[in-house]
Amino acid sequence: QGQDRHMIRMRQLIDIVDQLKNYVNDLVPEFLPAPEDVETNCEWSAFSCFQKAQLKSANTGNNERIINVSIKKLKRKPPSTNAGRRQKHRLTCPSCDSYEKKPPKEFLERFKSLLDKMDHQHLSSRTHGSEDS
């Protein structure tokens, strides 16, 4: 059941990113580190970079509440088992600052791409009976 919940959480994050993409014009147009083409075993490290990025509401429109709630939900910490797996390869993974910086629209697109990849990896690891994803 934990594995199913994990998958639900990852898919929920994809939906949150989709919702935020509707509000790109209401986000601070700041350039943020946006991992792309993340190498195998560095997915959790890249995920952490996306979570650390200072995505912010521009506080200009009426969508400030939903934007702030969504951003905060994107930063929900995965459990320590996943954090442990993240750490396993942290020495060989690029630092957050080394990734190309992109404006919010591309940042969110790349975040979604990573989440899709992690979701597929999780599915295939379950199919092959592995618990290590």
Epitope: I8, R9, D15, D18, Q19, R65, K72, P78
Partner: antibody, heavy 126, light 106 residues
Framework: QVQLVESGGGVVQPGRSLRLSCAAS????????MHWVRQAPGKGLEWVAF????????YYADSVKGRFTISRDNSKNTLYLQMNSLRAEDTAVYYC???????????????????WGQGTTVTVSS | EIVLTQSPGTLSLSPGERATLSCRAS???????LAWYQQKPGQAPRLLIY???SRATGIPDRFSGSGSGTDFTLTISRLEPEDFAVYYC???????FGQGTKVEIK
């Protein structure tokens, strides 16, 4: 069982204050965001306020901003709504509701209000 | 801020009939963010559907939700006597409710 019980409603004059309470039981209160929602007589539902599970963020409807304050005491499993400068248009049944999206990664994941109290009536009248 | 418009305002049907309730958003809503509630007179609302199409715990399978973008639908396949109530859609995160659709006995 999972339960929310509101209290503190009553009749109050315009401009006065009132504090509503919502006692939670049957679940880990500190893992859930909480809402206040109201319903004026014969009208629809109106969201009033939300507080994050740890109290770190609070959000308010424009109609109550600056007058109402949502707070919580996780050690007492209780949610509060402090209502100041009350107006006739604040007359309503006030419900507390649990946000269905738990802070726990493996917890509940509903984007909705999944548990509701029975409501407490607030009447603002001179 | 997003506005949710529900239609029709009132739906007059007989038990056993199919009810189709509409909720239209003024801006695109990610399906995870759309919920439906049922409220009977003198009672608190009850969560029926979350994520546009997932039934909440204990909700009978005659209730189903669908839709994406700006158009969402709640369908009750065969109305039972206890289903006559007011139904609200809601956008999560802004927590805006639609104005409600009353399903009444014809």
């Amino acid at each position: 069982q999972v339960q929310l019980v509101e209290s503190g409603g009553g009749v109050v004059q315009p401009g006065r204050s009132l504090r509503l309470s919502c006692a939670a039981s049957g679940f880990t209160f500190s893992s859930y965001g909480m809402h206040w929602v109201r319903q004026a007589p014969g009208k629809g539902l109106e969201w009033v306020a939300f507080i994050w599970y740890d109290g770190s963020d609070k959000y308010y409807a424009d109609s109550v901003k600056g007058r109402f304050t949502i707070s919580r005491d996780n050690s007492k499993n209780t949610l509060y709504l402090q209502m100041n400068s009350l107006r006739a248009e604040d007359t309503a049944v006030y419900y507390c509701a649990r946000d269905g999206d738990s802070s726990d990664w493996y917890g509940d994941y509903y984007f909705g209000m999944d548990v509701w109290g029975q409501g407490t009536t607030v009447t603002v009248s001179s | 801020e997003i506005v949710l418009t529900q239609s029709p305002g009132t739906l007059s049907l007989s038990p056993g009939e199919r009810a189709t309730l509409s909720c239209r958003a003024s801006q695109s809503v990610s399906s995870s963010y759309l919920a439906w509630y049922q409220q009977k007179p003198g009672q608190a609302p009850r969560l029926l559907i979350y994520g546009a199409s997932s039934r909440a715990t204990g909700i009978p399978d005659r209730f189903s939700g669908s839709g994406s973008g700006t158009d969402f639908t709640l369908t009750i396949s065969r109305l039972e006597p206890e289903d006559f109530a007011v139904y609200y859609c809601q956008q999560y995160g802004s927590w805006t409710f639609g104005q409600g659709t009353k399903v009444e006995i014809k």
